[in-house]
């Protein structure tokens, strides 16, 4: 098909030698096309132009991708050709870096429908360098942890040299859609949750006396939890006194939090303290009753299967223990009068 | 790893009921949503009711009405009660979860299948 239609777009890849990166390549089809196309229900019927010029399908992977040979050769399917680029939904993804992605990278509807559909397509110019800047030593990686709970933030790579008063403005994508609020080369997170983990991209021009480019940086965030640095707390039983019946069965129940270990070996156990005797009492398993990605909920009972008087003279201890440290908490048994 | 265990399929009644429940267990993980699909067979899986960690729920078309899914307060457990049961009901019901595990202190994403309970509705 005749490509000199296209809009064109022009992306620079400076990429570390030092480490593994990413890059994507977004099919930034014209609006409408693009809202209708890759992002399915952004225009609800009513909002749909009465003369939409591109009216594809509602298939999110229906774009096609092909890479312009430099030589002049047909336009080459990028799925066949190219085992290191994998295309997701709308977006192209480089998996390894080299200057051998230099190229044209062209963008369109798979489908057809009319003939304002041809020109709808986007010329991606995309020259990948090795960065050569030894001056910056400690950019940012491609790779950046938040830590859950806390604050944190996300650096742009190619920015993370220059102070926030001489930075361009940034534009920031999470996972291909826009931040439209993040214009700095810092996004500040006042709590990290689970969601922030993802692929963002950040973008930013570059203008020369010729031409400008669209310098883009991807950086992988992942959330991370850290060890704990508490004890675990008994969430049950709260009261040191329990009243009870006679002759009737009981049982008690030990609830206790445990919060991340990456080495985890939590203990829950029963222990029955009589004058100066102290024994383990052999109760059913513990089991984790609720969880979270910082902490666990275990639960363990201890069984009588009828209470008697010299049970009433005994202390049921809960003992709780990990790597910090541990807990207990006592229950003294009462009979209920009346 | 965080694995799911489905349980309560059987034979029923056209009219009868069933209640369907799914565990998941594992370590230091939450759980997004949970759903129940179901197959017959040389058909695709379907989506039959889901229900995310906030309690809003969806349905399928055809069960509206019969079906009920509900989870418990740790976010463990789902049933789907299913009641006027037809015998175009009759399939093998999956469950699914959606969430996020810590592995070793990095979150990463899950989505989970159960091994398949069989429901079959006749006379």
């Known amino acids: 098909f005749n490509i000199s239609g296209c809009s064109t777009k022009k992306l620079l890849w400076t990429y570390s030698t030092r480490s593994e990166e990413e890059f994507v390549l977004f099919c930034d089809l014209p609006e409408p096309q693009k809202s209708h196309f890759c992002h399915r229900n952004r225009l609800s019927p009513k909002q749909v132009p009465e003369h939409l010029p591109f009216m594809g399908s509602n298939d999110l992977s229906d774009v096609q991708w092909y890479q312009q040979p430099s030589n002049g050769d047909p336009l080459e399917d990028i799925r066949k050709s190219y085992p290191h680029i994998i295309q997701d939904k709308c977006t192209l993804h480089f998996l390894t870096p080299g200057v051998n992605n230099s190229g044209s990278y062209i963008c369109r509807p798979k489908m057809i429908k009319s003939p304002y559909d041809v020109a709808c397509c986007v010329k991606m110019i995309l020259e990948v360098k090795p960065q050569t800047n030894a001056s910056c030593e400690y950019s940012a990686s491609h790779k950046q942890d938040l830590l859950l709970g806390s604050t944190g933030s996300i650096s742009c790579p190619s920015l993370s040299c220059q102070s926030d008063a001489q930075s361009p403005a940034v534009t920031w994508y999470k996972n291909g859609k826009l931040l439209s609020v993040e214009r700095s080369n810092r996004i500040v997170v006042d709590e990290v949750y689970d969601y922030h983990q993802g692929t963002y991209v950040c973008d930013y021009t570059q203008s020369d006396t010729v031409s400008s480019w669209t310098v883009r940086a991807v950086v992988q965030v992942r959330t991370i939890v850290g060890d704990t640095k508490l004890k675990p707390d008994i969430l049950d039983p709260v009261e040191d006194t329990l009243e009870v019946e006679l002759g009737k069965p009981l049982t008690i129940s030990c609830k206790a939090r445990f919060g991340f270990e990456r080495v985890f070996n939590p203990v829950i156990k029963w222990y029955i303290k009589d004058s100066d005797l102290e024994w383990e009492v052999s109760v059913p398993e513990a089991k984790s009753i609720k969880s979270t990605l910082k902490d666990e909920i275990i639960e363990r009972n201890i069984i009588l299967e009828k209470v008697t008087q010299r049970d009433l003279r005994r202390k049921f201890v809960c003992f709780v223990q990990n790597s910090i440290g541990n807990t207990t908490q006592s229950v003294q048994l009462k009979e209920k009068r009346g | 790893d965080v694995q799911l265990q489905e349980s309560g399929g059987g034979l029923v009644q056209p009219g009868g009921s069933l209640r369907l429940s799914c565990a998941a267990s594992?370590?230091?993980?939450?759980?997004?949503?949970m759903g129940w699909y179901r197959q017959t067979p040389g058909k695709q899986r379907e989506l039959v009711a889901a229900?995310?960690?906030?309690?809003?729920?969806t349905y399928q078309d055809s069960v509206k009405g019969r079906f009920t899914i509900s989870r418990d307060n740790a976010n463990r457990t789902a049933n789907l009660y299913m009641n006027s049961l037809k015998s175009e009901d009759t399939a093998v019901y999956y469950c699914?979860?959606?969430?996020?595990?810590?592995?070793?202190?990095?979150?990463?994403?899950?989505?989970?299948w159960g091994q398949g309970t069989q429901v079959t509705v006749s006379s």
């Open positions: 699914n979860a959606d969430g996020r595990f810590n592995d070793n202190g990095y979150v990463k994403n899950f989505n989970i």
């Open positions: 594992g370590r230091f993980f939450t759980i997004n949503a």
């Open positions: 229900i995310t960690s906030d309690g809003s729920t």
